[in-house]
């Protein structure tokens, strides 16, 4: 079903994919479930959301629109933001909350990109990514403030209180209600 | 009963490609996320890949990642696995399993496997 | 070489005890992610025998009992007998390789006659 856009385009020069695959256009398949996906667009040069059947396809095709600019367009991850301090972020700060596919029931951290801070989320306990910490701490330090001394002080008193937690048992299946963006 | 059958293997070029099929029964299958582990004739298990139970999430480990595709019809209880640019070390007995079904986060039922033979 | 580390082979006679060791590390075991078993007789799928540590699926005997603490697990088998004659595989996830699935190398254990 897949079938690669022609590369007749010679004003694409410098503009070349990071993937083979990133020049295939988007391709829904033949089923019919409406799953929000994203690919990247040859010719704008960008990552376009579309609309996946479920089945089949090609591998030009995302989950969320980071993972599509992160996987084809070059030099994305070198202009990821930089932190007031100067240290770059790692890329993995900036992927959106992932609880995976299990059904655990385990408390982590992630950084989130909107609030700039490190909040408390529910872990299935299996697969996700890797914006996902142990501690609240180690999430700081790597996310929120790299390269910065220790975070501490009036902050971290206020942010505990914000994040107050609910111990609702988990969701009896994660992947029910996945985030689709 | 639950039962898990994989189909589609046989012996391809290396670079060439071949379609994995798992067909489900005996159970719910768009409730339950899936996943494929590979085996190496002697060798360990390898996880290879898994997806949601509606099919919009997938991941895969590193040695596979921009060449296989997993990827679910649940009109056809069918999990598939599209392996591209194959290589010599992809040559593997490959199983398909239901993730977290009973347990919360094991391969809890697995199929009999289908071998994947890449060779010139 | 996998990341999660078994013995290569066990043996022991019948109605003996014998234990299997997974030894893991911080990012995986040693982060709160569940351990797996998995019995895999031979020329067969591998098939669940212990979950979540220390969990027996509905018909496997009690004989396999599974324990894990700080950074490894273990699997102990009383009253071994043939037909537990076997490759055991232990599996958790690892955090440095954004939660992947991680199995042990896989340990040989032989019923002695």
């Known amino acids: 079903l897949s079938e690669e856009a022609d590369d007749t385009d010679s004003e694409l020069g410098s503009m070349k994919p990071l993937h083979t695959f990133c020049a295939m256009k988007a391709d829904d398949g033949p089923c019919k479930a409406m799953i929000r996906s994203y690919f990247f667009n040859m010719y704008t040069h960008q990552c376009e959301e579309f609309i996946y059947g479920g089945c089949e396809g090609n591998e030009n095709r995302f989950d969320t629109l980071e993972e599509c600019k992160k996987t084809c367009i070059p030099g994305y991850e070198k202009t990821a933001v930089k932190a007031a301090s100067g240290a770059e972020r790692p890329d993995f700060c900036f992927l959106e909350e992932d609880p995976g596919l299990c059904r655990g029931y385990m408390k982590r951290y992630l950084y989130n990109n909107q609030t700039k801070q490190c909040e408390r989320f529910v872990y299935g306990g299996c697969l996700g990514n890797r914006n996902n910490f142990e501690t609240l701490d180690e999430c700081k330090k790597i996310c929120e403030n790299p390269g910065g001394g220790s975070g501490g002080g009036l902050n971290d008193i206020f942010e505990a209180q914000k994040i107050e937690w609910h111990e609702g048992g988990p969701p009896h299946h994660h992947h029910h209600h996945h985030h689709h963006h | 009963e639950v039962q898990l059958l994989e189909s589609g293997g046989g012996l391809v070029q290396p670079g060439g490609s071949l379609r994995l099929s798992c067909a489900a029964s005996g159970f719910t299958f768009s409730s339950y996320a899936m996943s494929w582990v590979r085996q190496a004739p002697g060798k360990g298990l390898e996880w290879v890949s898994a997806i949601s139970g509606s099919g919009g999430s997938t991941y895969y480990a590193d040695s596979v990642k921009g060449r296989f595709t997993i990827s679910r019809d649940n009109s056809k209880n069918t999990l598939y696995l599209q392996m591209n640019s194959l290589r010599a070390e992809d040559t593997a007995v490959y199983y398909c399993?239901?993730?977290?079904?009973?347990?919360?986060?094991?391969?809890?039922?697995w199929g009999q496997g289908t071998m994947v033979t890449v060779s010139s | 070489q996998s990341v999660l580390t078994q013995p290569p082979s066990v043996s022991g006679a019948p109605g003996q005890r014998v234990t299997i060791s997974c030894t893991g590390s911080s990012s995986n075991i040693g982060a709160g992610y569940d351990v797996h078993w998995y019995q895999q007789l031979p020329g067969t799928a591998p098939k669940l025998l212990i979950y979540g540590n220390s969990n027996r699926p509905s018909g496997v005997p009690d004989r396999f009992s599974g324990s894990k603490s700080g950074t490894s697990a273990s699997l102990a088998i009383t009253g071994l007998q043939a037909e537990d004659e076997a490759d055991y595989y232990c599996q958790s996830y690892d955090s440095s390789l954004s939660g992947s699935g991680v199995f042990g190398g896989g340990t040989k254990l032989t019923v002695l006659g």
């Open positions: 399993a239901i993730l977290g079904a009973t347990s919360l986060s094991a391969f809890d039922i």
